[in-house]
């Protein structure tokens, strides 16, 4: 019962986590304009992994996709890759874990197979969560670096008279969603791995008992059908093709590759 609960809870937590990772990846608020020096700005900038947006005084928000792929900073590309890998692994993990759930009966699937699948999905969730946490952390580190760099040369005098305030960016909501979601996926994965230990049948070592018949002797050994606990034995190698991980490069080219954070 406890195993089923642990497995079920692990699945639900991972499901929420992966939904969060997907949400964070799609969100536009990875970095938002820092309002410390201009709290009354009528033009508010925020940026995501795929596009940058500007909310104007009219209330209208204009978003433009990063049209270029090669012109984008390598770090942004790395974050995109980490998030997509996290989503793909998480999605496969969810698919595997559905079939691994103890409460779902599929044909005559043995507990050993379910244990294998539970461990596989658990590992996938752990890696997925780590990918998301890593991606968000890399982006956050990039923001912190750029924030202090822009603070250092924040004011550039124009003839000593006019001040031009450089736009600085700070942590957006997507970062917090990503961290929490990555953490949940990681916790869900750990729970699945714990559940896997309970699913794997213990080896029963009964002593052989001999029954002597009057004519000839026949030996019957109980416990002869020993369940396999080797996790590698039942898994087949599947080739995964992900054709969906493409960027939505639309509208217009992004102004400057140095400007996105």
């Amino acid at each position: 019962m406890a195993v089923t609960a642990c497995q079920g809870l692990g699945f639900v937590v991972s499901l929420i986590g992966i939904a969060g990772i997907i949400a964070a990846t799609c969100m536009d608020q990875w970095s938002t304009q820092d309002l410390y020096n201009n709290p009354v700005t009528a033009v508010f900038n925020y940026q995501g992994l795929w596009r940058s947006c500007v909310r104007e005084s009219s209330g209208f928000t204009e978003c433009r996709g990063y049209f270029t792929l090669l012109g984008l900073p390598a770090m942004l590309q790395a974050v995109r890759a980490l998030m997509i890998v996290g989503i793909v692994l998480g999605a496969i993990g969810l698919l595997v874990s559905i079939f691994a759930l103890k409460c779902i009966r599929i044909g005559s699937m043995e507990d050993s197979a379910k244990a294998n699948m539970t461990l596989t999905s658990g590992i996938m969730f752990i890696v997925s969560g780590l990918c998301a946490i890593a991606g968000v952390s890399v982006f956050a580190n990039m923001l912190v670096t750029n924030f202090w760099m822009s603070t250092a040369n924040m004011y550039t005098g124009m003839g000593g008279m006019v001040q031009t305030v450089q736009t600085r960016y700070t942590f957006g909501a997507a970062l917090f969603v990503g961290w929490v979601a990555g953490g949940l996926t990681l916790i869900g994965g750990v729970m699945m791995c714990i559940a896997c230990r309970g699913l794997a049948p213990e080896e029963t070592n009964y002593k052989a008992v001999s029954y002597h018949a009057s004519g000839h002797s026949v030996a019957y050994k109980p416990g002869g059908f020993k369940a396999s606990t080797g996790f590698g034995s039942n898994t087949k190698n599947k080739k995964i093709y992900d054709g969906g991980a493409r960027t939505e490069d639309e509208v217009q080219s992004y102004p400057s590759k140095h400007d996105y954070v």
Epitope: Q33, T41, A42, N45, V54, E56, S58, G59, Q166, S256
Partner: antibody, heavy 115, light 113 residues
Framework: QVQLVQSGAEVKKPGASVKVSCKAS????????MHWVRQAPGQRLEWMGY????????SYNQKFQGRVTITVDTSASTAYMELSSLRSEDTAVYYC????????WGQGTTVTVSS | DIQMTQSPSSLSASVGDRVTMTCKSS????????????LTWYQQKPGKAPKLLIY???TRESGVPSRFSGSGSGTDFTLTISSLQPEDFATYYC?????????FGGGTKLEIK
């Protein structure tokens, strides 16, 4: 087409309040903020504040802070601007402004403050 | 608050003339997020509401004749009318659309010579 129709002219005594309405049509009312701008005779245009019809969020010019209140009735696609503690220098034409780039202006409401 | 200063305050010209008026802001109106300058130009005729001519410092509003053009970046902006028409005699205002409170210039009154 997009249109903003404002209420009629008002004559008020100093210390009184005035409430000007602005009925919007031809676009989705909640899509854009509604701004209020006034123009005293022979003076430059002066921004008073705005309201976000989606959530009722407002921002006011500090010059009018505490005296101006902007509200909306989304069901009627109407915005209201109330100015209290009127003084003679509040005599002006009051405009509501909306849509992208603040392109659409109401016809203006003349408010005269006189004892 | 951002101060907007327009010059000249009044200008006399004839039909067919090319006229230029300037607007200076006390702070930059350039937004690095989308590489736009948040300066707007309006035309106002006596007893009428202002009419949007140009936004983003240089983009003409639809329906505005091509003789109107805007230029400039950062803090210095210009509105040019290439060939004055009788209906162009009015007061022109520039507006900061970058920071609250939104502020307007004192206006340039264009009169018939």
């Amino acid at each position: 087409q997009v249109q903003l129709v404002q209420s009629g002219a008002e004559v008020k005594k100093p210390g009184a309040s005035v409430k000007v309405s602005c009925k919007a049509s031809g676009y989705t009312f909640t899509d854009y903020n509604m701004h209020w701008v006034r123009q005293a005779p022979g003076q430059r245009l002066e921004w008073m504040g705005y309201i976000n019809p989606n959530n009722g969020g407002t921002s006011y010019n500090q010059k009018f802070q505490g005296r101006v209140t902007i509200t909306v009735d989304t069901s009627a696609s109407t915005a209201y601007m109330e100015l209290s503690s009127l003084r003679s220098e509040d005599t002006a034409v009051y405009y509501c402004v909306t849509t992208r780039y603040l392109a659409v202006w109401g016809q203006g409401t003349t408010v005269t403050v006189s004892s | 608050d951002i101060q907007m200063t327009q010059s000249p305050s009044s200008l006399s010209a004839s039909v067919g003339d090319r006229v230029t008026m300037t607007c200076k802001s006390s702070q930059s109106l350039f937004n690095s997020g989308n590489q736009k300058n948040y300066l707007t130009w309006y035309q106002q005729k006596p007893g009428k509401a202002p009419k949007l001519l140009i936004y983003w410092a240089s983009t003409r509003e639809s329906g505005v004749p091509s003789r109107f053009s805007g230029s400039g970046s950062g803090t210095d902006f210009t509105l040019t009318i290439s060939s004055l028409q009788p209906e162009d005699f009015a007061t022109y205002y520039c507006q900061n659309d970058y920071s609250y409170p939104l502020t307007f210039g004192g206006g340039t009154k264009l009169e018939i010579k």
